[in-house]
């Protein structure tokens, strides 16, 4: 089995995504996410569909899951705002918008992360970053520390194939390799950072890792523009 | 044992740019945060520039920022500062700094900075 | 942005004996505070870091404490090496602001 972090990637540079958000319930990390802006989280709906009765809260400025950083701080949720046509069936429309009880405390380990507005297709071939504290190989251990994986880009029509995600792959989504590196369960809602921008969201399907044949599916955010500056508004 | 040297200060016109380096040894150079910080002719230290271990994130305070860059160079072990558009309020002693425990651990002894006409 | 208010700025005692220099922060910094001792020529020496952690190699007469907003530091048995400006920082949030310093001359 693929061994190494995410799934065959490596620790990641200490507070050197700024925009790195933990999802947690109850104390403990559920999903990723990516800070937006000063009070919003970008994440995936399908994280908090089993939170109904636990405390959702946001890590912010975290390198170690447990260790004391000065510029780790959890937030409490005010509002969470999942997209209004996600459903617990399918992939499409995985986002969720997390509102914080309060504006971030910005900093070098505390920063937005700007995102993609133009709906346009990411080069097949383009190196893109994904981060996350998702589980590091197949027997499910999870990392402490921030892990990351530099994937390609996968052109749709291959990833639409019937022998990957046979037509599933939408306009509003997008693919990237998952050859031995991959995205990984514990990943989903992290972003897909390509040349400093915010293109993607880790879905949170359920989806066997670091197979090829079953590449990374990720949420366009450029696709989603309308919808995220209405909530934010 | 742990030594930081910095070099590049000078005086220097109003308006005028200036790159410092600091010169790193006796440990892993690559492993650390690294930070500037100056100490102004009232005494008064202040934090300037801040870079991770690898270069992926830098830090600037709004006093600096768009003014002053810090970089790295790990196969050379230094640290860098460009400053441009000098103003006579940026007359110091800057110093290069090491980060462990996020406090500011290992100081150089600094290099002065004059910003006259 | 948080700032420090560091008291008093100047300050003179005797061979042997104790001084204390206080930090106030603007609002809660977590107990992240560092005290450094500056003498002219050289950079600053980290002693303490997190509010009460002694560097190696410093030796025991020199302690911090404190929380939430107010922290102290102190030398005791004040030695004639011990003639530096004295400076606290406040690195929560890895946002680093420092007290205005303190001047320490032995009578």
């Known amino acids: 089995p693929p061994r190494g972090r995410i799934l065959g990637g490596r620790e990641a540079e200490a507070h050197a995504r700024p925009y790195m958000a933990s999802v947690q319930l109850n104390g403990a990390h559920l999903c990723g996410g990516v800070l937006v802006a000063e009070q919003w989280v970008l994440s995936a709906a399908h994280c908090l569909e089993d939170a109904a009765d636990g405390k959702v809260q946001v890590l912010l400025g975290a390198h170690s899951l447990s260790q004391p950083e000065p510029s780790k701080r959890l937030y409490d949720v005010l509002r969470a705002v999942p997209h209004p046509d996600s459903q617990p069936d399918t992939i499409d429309h995985d986002l969720l918008l997390l509102q914080l009880s309060e504006k971030a405390t910005l900093g070098p380990a505390v920063r937005p992360l700007p995102w993609q507005r133009v709906d346009r297709d990411v080069a097949p071939g383009t190196l893109c970053d994904v981060a996350g504290w998702g589980i590091v190989n197949h027997a499910g251990r999870r990392p402490d520390s921030l892990q990351h994986v530099l994937l390609p880009v996968l052109d749709r029509a291959t990833c639409n194939r019937r022998t990957h995600h046979d037509g599933a792959i939408t306009e509003r989504l997008m693919c990237a390799e998952s050859n031995r590196r991959d995205s990984c369960k514990g990943d989903s809602g992290g972003p897909l950072v390509c040349g400093g921008v915010l293109e993607g969201v880790v879905t949170s399907g359920s989806r066997v890792c670091g197979n090829r044949k079953k590449p990374g599916i990720y949420t366009r955010v450029a696709s989603y523009a309308a919808w995220i500056d209405s909530v934010l508004a | 044992e742990v030594k930081l040297v910095e070099s590049g200060g000078g005086l220097v016109q109003p308006g005028g740019s200036l790159k410092l380096s600091c010169a790193a040894s006796g440990f892993t150079f690559s492993n650390y945060i690294m930070s500037w910080v100056r100490q102004t002719p009232e005494k008064r230290l202040e934090w300037v520039a801040y870079?991770?271990?690898?270069?992926?994130?830098?830090y600037y305070p709004d006093t600096v920022k768009g003014q002053f860059t810090i970089s790295r160079d790990n196969a050379k072990n230094t640290l860098y500062l460009q400053m441009s558009s000098l103003k006579s309020e940026d007359t110091a002693i800057y110093y290069c700094?090491?980060?462990?425990?996020?406090?500011?651990?290992?100081w150089g002894q600094g290099t002065s900075v004059t910003v006259s006409s | 942005d948080i700032q420090m208010t560091q008291s008093p700025s100047s300050l003179s005692a005797s061979l042997g004996g104790k001084v204390t220099i206080t930090c106030k922060a603007s609002q809660d910094i977590n107990k992240y505070i560092a005290w450094y001792q500056h003498k002219p020529g050289k950079g600053p020496r980290l002693l303490i870091h997190y509010t009460s952690t002694l560097q190696p190699g410093i030796p025991s007469r020199f302690s911090g404490s404190g929380s939430g907003r107010d922290y102290s530091f102190s030398i005791s048995n004040l030695e004639p090496e011990d003639i530096a400006t004295y400076y606290c920082l406040k690195y929560d949030n890895l946002l680093y602001t420092f007290g205005g310093g303190t001047k320490l001359e032995i009578k």
């Open positions: 700094a090491r980060h462990d425990f996020y406090a500011l651990d290992f």
């Open positions: 870079i991770t271990n690898g270069g992926g994130a830098t």
